[in-house]
Each structure stands twice: as structure tokens, then as C-alpha cells.
């Protein structure tokens, strides 16, 4: 029961996280005009990964897309790439995890397959979350660097010094959405990986049996480990039990303690 809850919660948390990563990637407010210690301007500037916007006090908002690839800073391209990779991995992870959910029955899918799918989706969520966190952090670092470089410049105009206001940018809402979303996706991924351990079918505990063959005596222990070192020619009855494998004479599946729906 706990495994199903952990898996379900991991899925929901990851789903919220990936929705947040998508939202953050699409948001225009990655960087917003710093209003602290600034002359009061009637124009508010903010920028996203795909376009920059200006909101005027009149209520009019104008957004312009970055209609160039080569002209954009490499860091911005890197952030875009990280966010997109995060979304793609997260989306694939969600797709995989849906089929891996314990509460969903698909044909005669075995627990081992569900466990593997849960682990795969968990890893995908972790990488997706890390991509988002990395992308947002790279952008934040870029902002901090630019902030201190963007001090007010002085231009010499006709009749003396004329000050121009250099727009400085600070952290926008999208950064916080991205950090939280990335964190949630990461947590969801970890939960899926934890759930995977509980989903993996337990090894059947076979009692140690001594086979008294005409040749060397070989004792067999569970887990496929041969206790004896005697290698004789008579090996027809030497059966090694593997935790996940099933032999012909074990076609019926044994319920594990986690097989409650």
C-alpha cells in the first residue's frame, strides 16, 4: 500500500513540477526591471526566454519576439536548451510513469516491468528537474552579473551632462516558478525511484536443499549462489534460482506482500 501511495504521490508531484517547468519556460517575466532606487518611469520592462515586453502606465503592453537565433547570447540559448530538454524528458517520464502506475492494469504486465518503468520515469524526472534548476540558475547568475554592470551611464549632451537611465533587471517571477517546479520534479523523481524498490518482486525464499547425486554433492542456496565448489560432470539437476526468473515448472506467480490494489 505504501509503495502505491509513494508511486502515486511521486507521479502527482512530478506532474505539478513539469507543468510548472512548462509554465516557467513560457512566462515572459524571467527578468523584470529593477524599480528600487530608480527614477519613477512610466514604463515597466520585463523579459522572457522568447520575447521582451514593455508595459506602459497607459495600460498598453507591447511584446517583441526575439526573431533571431544567431544574434542571441549563448547563455540564453543554453537556458532555452536546458528548459526544453527538461520539458521533453519530463513529458516522456510522465508517459512512462502512467503505464508504470501500480493502480493501472495493462494486460499482463509483470511487476518487474512496472518496477523498471517506474525507475526509468523516476530517473527522467530527476534529470528533468535538474535541467530546469540548472537553466533557471544559469539565467539568475547572468542577471546578477549584468545587474552590477548596468550602473547609470552619463552621456554628454548639448549644454552639459545629461543623465540617461540605464534599465537594470532583477529576478522575475518565472525564476521562482522554475526553481520550485524543478525542485518538485526532482522530489517526484526521487519518490518514483523509492517506489521502484518496493515494486521489484521479492526473491522467493527457497530453503537450502541437498541433492544427493551419484557424483559430487552440491548444496544450493537461494539467490543463485553455489555453496559448493565441486564441479562434476553430472550437472543435469543443477538448478540455479534467480530472483526474477521463472522456470517452466513455476508458471504460477506467487503473490508478494505488495500486491494489494
Amino acid at each position: 500500500m505504501a509503495v502505491t501511495a509513494c508511486q502515486g504521490l511521486g507521479f502527482v508531484v512530478s506532474l505539478i513540477g513539469i507543468a510548472g517547468i512548462i509554465a516557467a519556460t513560457c512566462m515572459d517575466q524571467w527578468s523584470t526591471q529593477d524599480l528600487y532606487n530608480n527614477p519613477v518611469t512610466a514604463v515597466f520592462n520585463y523579459q522572457g526566454l522568447w520575447r521582451s515586453c514593455v508595459r506602459e502606465s497607459s495600460g498598453f503592453t507591447e511584446c517583441r519576439g526575439y526573431f533571431t537565433l544567431l544574434g542571441l547570447p549563448a547563455m540564453l540559448q543554453a537556458v532555452r536548451a536546458l528548459m526544453i530538454v527538461g520539458i521533453v524528458l519530463g513529458a516522456i517520464g510522465l508517459l512512462v510513469s502512467i503505464f508504470a502506475l501500480k493502480c493501472i492494469r495493462i494486460g499482463s504486465m509483470e511487476d518487474s516491468a512496472k518496477a523498471n518503468m517506474t525507475l526509468t520515469s523516476g530517473i527522467m524526472f530527476i534529470v528533468s528537474g535538474l535541467c530546469a534548476i540548472a537553466g533557471v540558475s544559469v539565467f539568475a547568475n547572468m542577471l546578477v552579473t549584468n545587474f552590477w554592470m548596468s550602473t547609470a551611464n552619463m552621456y554628454t549632451g548639448m549644454g552639459g551632462m545629461v543623465q540617461t537611465v540605464q534599465t537594470r533587471y532583477t529576478f522575475g517571477a518565472a525564476l521562482f516558478v522554475g526553481w520550485v517546479a524543478g525542485g518538485l520534479t526532482l522530489i517526484g523523481g526521487v519518490m518514483m525511484c523509492i517506489a521502484c524498490r518496493g515494486l521489484a518482486p521479492e526473491e522467493t525464499n527457497y530453503k537450502a536443499v541437498s541433492y544427493h547425486a551419484s557424483g559430487h554433492s552440491v548444496a544450493y542456496k537461494p539467490g543463485g549462489f553455489k555453496a559448493s565448489t565441486g564441479f562434476g560432470s553430472n550437472t543435469k539437476n543443477k538448478k540455479i534460482y534467480d530472483g526474477g526468473a521463472r522456470t517452466e515448472d513455476e508458471v504460477q506467480s506467487y503473490p508478494s506482500k505488495h500486491d494489494y490494489v
Epitope: Q33, P39, V40, T41, A42, V43, N45, Q47, S52, C53, V54, E56, S57, S58, G59, F60, E62, R64, Y155, V162, Q163, T164, V165, Q166, T167
Partner: antibody, heavy 118, light 113 residues
Amino acid sequence: EVQLVESGGGLVKPGGSLRLSCAASGFTFSSYGMSWVRQAPGKGLESVSTISGGDSYTYYPDSVRGRFTISRDIAKNSLYLQMNSLRAEDTAVYYCARSYNGNSLPYWGQGTLVTVSS
Amino acid sequence: DIVMTQSPDSLAVSLGERATINCKSSQSLLNSGNQRNYLTWYQQKPGQPPKLLIYWASTRESGVPDRFSGSGSGTDFTLTISSLQAEDVAVYYCQNNYFYPFTFGQGTKLEIK
């Protein structure tokens, strides 16, 4: 069609108060920035207060700050200018104007005259 | 507050001739976010409210004749009437729309010579 009609002007004694109203129609009132602009007889234009679109922040020049208050009633589609501690130099035609692109003022009312005199 | 200075205070131009009015601001009105200059030009005739001519320093308002044009960037701006018509006699004002409070120039009175 955008329409702005000012009212509330008149004669008032120095130190007195007056409340100007501007009835707006033909647009979504809360979405646009609005301004009160005055013009003293034979003089130039002076912006006395601005309320921004959406967030409704208010701004005043030093000449009226602390004495004038701009506000709006979205339900009534009305803009107001509360003028206290009036002085002789506040005598002017007061225009209500709606802003748009570039914070410019494409729409103006016909104005209302405020006379401050003893 | 931002100081807007217009020159000349008055201008007399012959019909069909070019009229040029200048406006200078004490601070740059250029917004780096969209590379637009927040300067507006108005025309006011006696007994009427002002009429918007140009916004963003060079964008003509719809319905304004194309003989009116605006130019300039940063702190120096110009309104040009390419061929003066009788109906263009008025007072012209520039306005800072970038910094609060929005301030107007003192006005330039345009007359026919």
C-alpha cells in the same frame, strides 16, 4: 466611441476644496491610464495627476502633491480629482484625458473651469 | 521633475513652407527595453483641448496628415510640418511620457508669415 465629460468646476475661495468628476464611456475604464491636465488662462499645459492602467498607481507633480488626490470608481466609470487647500495659482481649465500608446493622451474631455478667488 | 524646453517660443512661417519646432528634455526619454522614445507632440487651437499628433517621438496618430513628422532620440526631438497649411496655426506642445510626473514643454506658437 470614447467620450470624456468633466464636471464639478466652479468658483472657490483660497484654502477651499473642490471635487472634479470625469464620466468616461466607450472603453474598458479600468484598463487604461487616466490623467488630469490643467491649463491656466493664457498659459501652457500642466499634468497635475496620473493614475496608471490596471494597477492604478497614482502620481503627482510637486506643485500639487499632498493637496490633490486622483481616484477612480470602476463601477461608475468615473475619474475624480479631489482638490484641497486650493490656491489662486490653481485657477485653470482642468481636462480629463485617457492615455494609450507611448503613454500619450489621444482622448480629451472639453474641460471644466476652476476659479480660485476671494 | 523632468524639464522640457521648446524652441522657439513662437514661429512665423509662410504657407507651403517648412516649419520646424524643437524640444529638449533634461533626461533621455529612450527606453532601452523597446528602443522607443517616450515623447509626444500635441497641437492646440484656441478654445479646444489639445490634439495628439505624434507619439513615441515619430509615430503619427491615425488621422493626422502626413505633412506632420517627428524625429529625434534621447534628449533632442523635432516636430516638422513639411508644407504649412492655414489650419496648422496653433500652439504646439511636446510632452515627456517616460518619467513621472509627465511634463510639457512651454509651447511654441505657430503663425503664418
